[in-house]
């Protein structure tokens, strides 16, 4: 098992912006915005100016019962956040069709803003979460999930798309971030590292976790993804960190046991329906939230990110299976498929719980550095 206690870290929430034109041109970075050291090569995601978004009202759902025993982020040690040593690289790319700029990859040419100008936006994902700087927002109620326990039939498509492993979800999985903030789940996918190298996209005080699950949702205000891209709140992603624990995770095993069948890029298989909520942490009440973007091109903004405080435990063998089974284009392994963390550029990450309160004896009074923007009130 990993680290025992992770101290609160970075901001989520309030002020990230969406694009009015989903995949339209954004202002590209100005000269003084130079690439950050921890960016993988070819991914100079420099800020461009944009209008700040208004927040959309969305829906409410039913809290999930709490289970004990999973590691919590606030139980992990504080770690320094130097430039990330493990550069995301792409092992999922082939320049088979010449200079096609839609052939993006991790950690190499072409630079992502050339693939999609939105990737140079000011409010990108992933980010480093620093709980001490998060704004406690009591208005952030427990997430509500409905219909996530799927019957075995119909089966679901599990595909190696060259960038990740993706499970396409059927209609009927409903999620609410709060009253009037309702969404439908579309798909889930994972990000991971390589042997001895963690591969989560978000970090907590610079700590990168072994892997991360993303469940992507479409707002019920939109019928299709193409209508929602770049609209504030049009898409919402539930994200959870995957950690090493002593036992096999039976929910994840239903997917991991099938990865060999889709080892080759582009291959797919059908898997029986399963309880999707079992792939997420049990505590739906403690999370960080901020507005960011898709973490792969086209990098459209306006995406509401909800990052669980509680982590999910997989066995060492399962994490190895995840990072060591799939292949990308050519003869390269599909590994280290994460984007470098992006600057907050003034965004404040919100927390549904007092993550920034220092309970150590040093502080006479609990200190919360940022105040809640009361989104959703």
């Amino acid at each position: 098992q990993r680290l025992p206690r992770m101290q609160e870290d970075s901001p989520l929430g309030g002020g990230s912006s969406g694009e009015d034109d989903p995949l339209g041109e954004e202002d590209l970075p100005s000269e003084e915005d130079s690439p950050r050291e921890e960016d993988p090569p070819g991914e100079e995601d420099l800020p461009g100016e944009e209008d700040l978004p208004g927040e959309e009202d969305l829906p409410e759902v039913k809290p999930k019962s709490e289970e004990e025993g999973s590691l919590k982020l606030e139980d992990l040690p504080t770690v320094e956040a130097p430039g990330d040593p493990q550069e995301p690289q792409n092992n999922a790319h082939r320049d088979k069709e010449g200079d096609d700029q839609s052939h993006w990859r991790y950690g190499g040419d072409p630079p992502w803003p050339r693939v999609s100008p939105a990737c140079a936006g000011r409010f990108q994902s992933p980010v480093d979460i620093r709980p001490q700087l998060a704004a406690f927002c009591p208005a952030l109620r427990p997430l509500e999930l409905l219909g996530f326990q799927l019957p075995p039939l119909p089966e679901l498509r599990l595909r190696n798309n060259g960038h990740s492993v993706q499970l396409t979800l059927p209609p009927g999985l409903e999620m609410a971030l709060g009253p009037g903030r309702e969404y439908r789940a579309l798909q889930l996918h994972l990000h991971w590292g390589a042997a001895g190298r963690p591969g989560s996209e978000h970090t907590v005080e610079g700590h990168r976790f072994p892997a991360e699950i993303h469940v992507v949702h479409l707002s019920t205000a939109f019928a299709r993804v193409d209508e929602a891209l770049g609209r504030p709140g049009g898409l919402a992603v539930l994200a959870a960190f995957l950690e090493e624990g002593p036992e096999e995770n039976s929910a994840y095993e239903q997917l991991l046991s099938r990865l060999e069948e889709i080892a080759e890029e582009g291959s797919e298989t059908q898997v029986p329906g399963l309880d999707i909520s079992a792939l997420l942490p049990s505590d739906f009440s403690r999370y960080f939230q901020y507005e960011g973007s898709l973490t792969t091109p086209p990098c459209a903004q306006g995406v509401i990110w909800t990052v669980f405080n509680q982590t999910v435990m997989l066995s060492a063998k399962q994490l190895h299976t995840l990072s060591d089974t799939l292949w990308g284009p050519g003869d390269s392994r599909l590994q280290l498929n994460f984007r470098a963390t992006q600057p907050l550029n003034g965004r404040v990450i919100e927390a549904s719980f007092p993550a920034g309160v220092d309970s150590s004896p040093r502080a006479a009074e609990p200190v919360q550095l940022n105040s809640c923007l009361a989104a959703g009130d």
Epitope: P22, W104, V225, P329
Partner: nanobody
Framework: QVQLQESGGGLVQPGGSLRLSCAAS???????????MAWYRQAPGKQRELVAV???????KYSDSVKGRFTISRDSAKNTVLLQMNSLKPEDTAVYYC????????WGQGTQVTVSS
């Protein structure tokens, strides 16, 4: 609203060739540059099956039944995906559907391919 439109189907003799095309249209047609594109087919009374897929990185995958006879390609600039079908057999008779997988599935209406003498 984005739409996928297949064309190129028809009646062909065994051993013959056809070239199916799938064109994307609509305001946000750009997103198909970032979609895995695939051809599926459905024969009468059978389940829809994957024929071929091309990922955003240009990687291709074929079902065993068409390997070596069919070729999938994409022209991202023109938002089209092609399926070149050679050495056609009667068992290739089906409705062929174009699919784009970008966060959700987009489907065309299908085009009929009939292989018969």
């Amino acid at each position: 609203q984005v739409q996928l439109q297949e064309s190129g189907g028809g009646l062909v003799q065994p051993g013959g060739s056809l070239r199916l095309s799938c064109a994307a249209s609509g305001n946000s047609v750009n997103i198909f540059r970032f979609a895995a594109m695939a051809w599926y087919r459905q024969a009468p009374g059978k389940q829809r099956e994957l024929v071929a897929v091309i990922t955003t990185t240009g990687g291709t995958k074929y079902s065993d039944s068409v390997k070596g006879r069919f070729t999938i390609s994409r022209d991202s600039a023109k938002n089209t995906v092609l399926l070149q079908m050679n050495s056609l057999k009667p068992e290739d008779t089906a409705v062929y559907y174009c699919n784009a997988d970008y966060l959700q599935d987009y489907w065309g209406q299908g085009t009929q391919v009939t292989v018969s003498s």
